[in-house]
């Protein structure tokens, strides 16, 4: 008899989840020299212990302690790069810029970058047909709690100037909803962050307005000014040439404004 | 490129012991699980032993468990199988593989050796 199975409105677990997990583990400890005292069977054993036999809407950071404990990660403060919906430009940017770091490049958000997860209560399987959504299900879910116990933990680590990365192509270039708006700007610690630095990614050639001035970025601002972290920001006219003018810094085309 | 060579392996006596070992080249021994695996004459591939990629786990097969220990020197990129109590059941060829881990049911295995032929008879 087929046993009852709740239906949750999200995609479920990323399809061999365990292995992906596992080899993502072993592929960061070869290129991460500094990371080779990680056994990554204590930490796959720790990732399927936050959330196997428990109800997905019941997870809390308390659950993900023992695999934070065993992802504990130096890496240098003053070059941290936060984002908010645009992933993958940052990511471009510290392939390129190595001495900077994104949450994903370190080990723990390596791990489990793109990926969906969720068990069941009392059971010891993962459940690969469908996961709770954030809204439509709830917030205490395996994935969601993951990453705002990971990215609370890598803002208060945060030193000197932090940079974020923002998109100007959006509505909300500033979304007070996002992991960085809700999670980050609030556990930046101003006793060791100077300044919070934005950088607003426009998103059309001719686009040649100050997103700075956004009312969004404003709202930053204040929200930063009442921490006591300086603020400031840049526009990134040509997301394209920055990048390249990273790789190229010689360039005579990159003394311009990017 | 990835080379795992087995030896060790012998002529033994039921109740006797045995020492294989491993030596791996051309990857990054200390990132990877390792396990043994072995193919008795006439069946199939069966699982005999993992070790984590810094020895901290350790996992056996019930039929060897108590009798069978896995060790590793990443400091030298080697790894043991020590064989007590042999049974007439352990003859097989006995070959290293290297992998990412253990989920619980499944063993992740990349690469895997020649094998050493282990033979347990009187």
């Known amino acids: 008899v087929p046993r009852w199975r709740q239906q949750w409105s999200g995609p479920g677990t990323t399809k061999r989840f365990p292995e992906t997990v596992l080899a993502r583990c072993v592929k960061y400890t070869e290129i991460h020299p500094e990371m080779r005292h990680v056994d990554c069977q204590s930490v796959w054993d720790a990732f399927k212990g936050a959330f196997i036999s428990k109800h997905p809407c019941n997870i809390t950071e308390e659950d993900y302690q023992p695999l934070m404990k065993l992802g504990t990660q130096t890496v240098p403060c003053n070059k941290i790069l936060l984002w908010s919906r645009i992933k993958d430009l940052a990511h471009q940017f510290t392939q390129v810029q190595r001495d900077m770091f994104t949450l994903e490049d370190t080990l723990l958000g390596y791990l489990a970058d793109d990926l969906t997860w969720c068990g069941e209560f009392n059971t010891s399987k993962i459940n690969y047909q469908s996961c709770p959504d954030w809204r439509k299900d709830c917030s205490n879910n395996p994935v969601s709690v993951f990453w705002k116990t990971v990215s609370r933990r890598f803002a208060e680590a945060a030193c000197d100037v932090v940079h974020v990365m923002l998109n100007g192509s959006r509505s909300k270039i500033f979304d007070k909803n996002s992991t960085f708006g809700s999670v980050e700007v609030h556990n930046l610690q101003p006793e060791k962050v100077q300044t919070l630095e934005a950088w607003v990614i426009h998103g059309g050639r001719e686009d040649s307005r100050d997103l700075c001035q956004d009312p969004t970025i404003k709202e930053l601002e204040s929200i930063i000014s009442k921490r006591n972290i300086q603020f400031s920001c840049k526009n990134i006219y040509r997301p394209d040439k920055f990048l390249q003018c990273v790789k190229n810094p010689e360039d005579s085309s990159c003394t311009s404004e990017i | 490129e990835v080379q795992l060579l087995e030896s060790g392996g012998g002529l033994v006596q039921p109740g006797g012991s045995l020492r294989l070992s491993c030596a791996a080249s051309?990857?990054?021994?200390?990132?990877?699980?390792m396990s043994w695996v072995r193919q008795a004459p006439g069946k199939g591939l069966e699982w005999v032993s993992g070790?984590?990629?810094?020895?901290?786990?350790?996992y056996y097969a019930d039929n060897v468990k108590g009798r069978f220990i896995i060790s590793r020197d990443n400091s030298k990129n080697t790894l043991d199988l020590q064989m007590n109590s042999l049974r007439a059941d352990d003859t097989a060829v006995y070959y290293c593989?290297?992998?990412?881990?253990?989920?619980?049911?499944?063993?992740?295995?990349?690469?895997r050796g020649q094998g050493t032929l282990v033979t347990v008879s009187s």
């Open positions: 051309g990857f990054t021994f200390s990132s990877y699980a």
């Open positions: 593989a290297s992998g990412k881990g253990w989920d619980g049911n499944t063993w992740y295995e990349d690469y």
């Open positions: 070790i984590s990629n810094r020895g901290v786990n350790t």
